[in-house]
Each structure stands twice: as structure tokens, then as C-alpha cells.
């Protein structure tokens, strides 16, 4: 039975050329997190596995940094980075939990963080 919820940074915005931290947090479950995948549409950006550690996909390694924690830092943002990002928590014994973050990369300097929200 999947009882947990994923809290994410929700809808966020950031300036072109800047950086942003994508963060998710799994709560309300005692399940062990065995792996976290970070994905964007049809791209697998990074994996953090309890045994193997972090892997950043080769096409992103120049602009993506692991952490903090199980989060992901995107650097040198471009407007093409605008879109949906998913944190996928693989857990034992529950299974898979998915959180969604929408990132908007802005040309101007009026970027603000959105509200946090939860996905069960």
C-alpha cells in the first residue's frame, strides 16, 4: 500500500543564464528510497541509486549537478529548459512515487519561486 506523498518545489521560475535547484521530498511513509530518477519529458537527466550513487546523463553533464541531497541543480539555464520535470522515487516496499515540477526560464529578472504543492 502506497501511503507516502511527494512534496516538490512546485511551479518555479528562474532567469536565463542562472541556476535552479529542483527538489522533492518523500514523506508519510517508512519505505526505503532505493533510487531517484530525474526526468524531463523524454529525457532521463540523472539517477541517484543507493548502491551505485549518482549518474548524470552524458548530454546533461555540463549543465546538471547532483544535489543538494536527492535534488538536482540545473545551471546555465536557457529558455529551452522551460517545461515539466519529474522526480521519480523508487522505494521498497511501496514502489514508485512521482513528483512534478514546472520550470519557466525567463529572459528578464523578475523570476520568482512558486508555491510548494503535494502529489500523492
Amino acid at each position: 500500500m502506497m501511503t507516502g506523498t511527494i512534496e516538490t518545489t512546485g511551479n518555479i521560475s528562474a532567469e536565463k543564464g542562472g541556476s535552479i535547484i529542483l527538489q522533492c521530498h518523500l514523506s508519510s511513509t517508512t519505505a526505503q528510497v532505493t533510487q531517484v530518477n530525474w526526468e524531463q519529458q523524454d529525457q532521463l537527466l540523472a539517477i541517484c541509486n543507493a548502491d551505485l550513487g549518482w549518474h548524470i546523463s552524458p548530454s546533461f553533464k555540463d549543465r546538471v549537478a547532483p544535489g543538494p541531497g536527492l535534488g538536482l541543480t540545473l545551471q546555465s539555464l536557457t529558455v529551452n529548459d522551460t517545461g515539466e520535470y519529474f522526480c521519480i522515487y523508487h522505494t521498497y516496499p511501496d514502489g514508485t512515487y512521482t513528483g512534478r515540477i514546472f520550470l519557466e526560464v525567463l529572459e528578464s529578472s523578475v523570476a520568482e519561486h512558486g508555491a510548494r504543492f503535494q502529489i500523492p
Epitope: M2, E39, S57, Y92, T98
Partner: antibody, heavy 120, light 107 residues
Amino acid sequence: EVQLQQSGPELVKPGASVKISCKASGYSFTGSYIHWVKQNHVKTLEWIGRINPHNGPTSYNQNFKGKASLTVDLSSSTAYMEVHSLTSEDSAVYYCVRYDGYYGGALDYWGQGTSVTVSS
Amino acid sequence: DIQMTQSPSSLSASLGERVSLTCRASQEISGYLSWLQQKPDGTIKRLIYAASTLDSGVPKRFSGSRSGSDYSLTISSLESEDFADYYCLQYASYPYTFGGGTKLEIK
């Protein structure tokens, strides 16, 4: 015991579509992603894409965007893949595979495969 | 896409013999690799994941190892049921990609 039971062989005409089913049992269907893999007549394996049964997000191999569509029916714990505009190149065996959502070990349990033959 | 170059493409060996298959990744995959066995009836079974972790129920004569970008599957002493096709799979990046396969036949 985890099982993925696929539908039977299909003989279809060029230009038509085919929909293959994959019924999951022995685990929580929403707890693990379902992936699809193609094996052609020379035994080459090719990853098509995956779907999150919990809330439906998909990721596709660019080679299969517009060619394959992935869906699920939660009420019957069944995943589906529809292949469109069939040509002889689509004649192959198609496998559904469970992503190991518990230990993060990728594709663990495989369906028995569904043979699709495209012929007029 | 990450290319997985598998060798040899075919291999004839005798019962009791030790054999090794290799996959080389064109880019870093950090150990996110599994080995699959396909029987003649088409059934596919995962043997190893995370480069060296044996699946439950898989005989201990199977082992996986890594040296840099080279990943190996070794069968220490071949038994009759081991004659099959073997594939490596990288799951570090989309699209997941497979090796070309090794057909293991009885000599």
C-alpha cells in the same frame, strides 16, 4: 509471483494499427512503470518507451514518437501499446516489461512477447 | 544515444567450460547495466543488474563485473540450460539501449 501476460499474435495489413495488451498481476500495478521493447527479425532489441500507470506520464524513444502510443487501464491492471501506420518494418516481437520500482534495477520482469506480422 | 557494443556475437563452448561475454559502453553509464538471457522460445529473464548484482533465483555460476567502460558476464561452468542468447542493457540514459546479443551454442 509477478506476471505480465501479453495478448496473442497479430497478423495485420500495411497501413493499419494494432493494439497489444499486457495484463499485470502479482504486484501493485501502480507501483512500477511499464516499459515496451521491440525485437526485430534479426533479434535486435530496441527500447520504445515507458508509462507511469499511476498517473499516465509517458517517455518515448524519439524513433517511436508518433509510431507507438502507450496507455493503461487501472481497473484491469493492464497496459496497452498501439502501433500505428504499420509497415513491414514493424513486423517484430513486442515485449512489455516491468521497471523494478523497488530496488532500482531497471527492467526486471518481462512479458512473454507478442508477435506482430505486417503483411497484405 | 549510448551505443552498447557486445562481443562476441556468437560463441561455441562445451559443458563445464568457463565463458565471458563483454559489453562496452560508448559513454559513461556508471554501472547502470543489466544482463538478460533469452531462451529459444523467446522468454527473457534478467540475470544481473547494477553491473554485478545477481537476481534472486539466478545460479551463482553467473557473475557480472565492470572495468571502466567494459562490462562482463561470466558463467563459471556451463550447464545445458545456459545455452541461449544473452544481451546487455544500459539504463543510465534514455533511450535505453541494448547490446547486439551473444548466441551461446553447444560445441
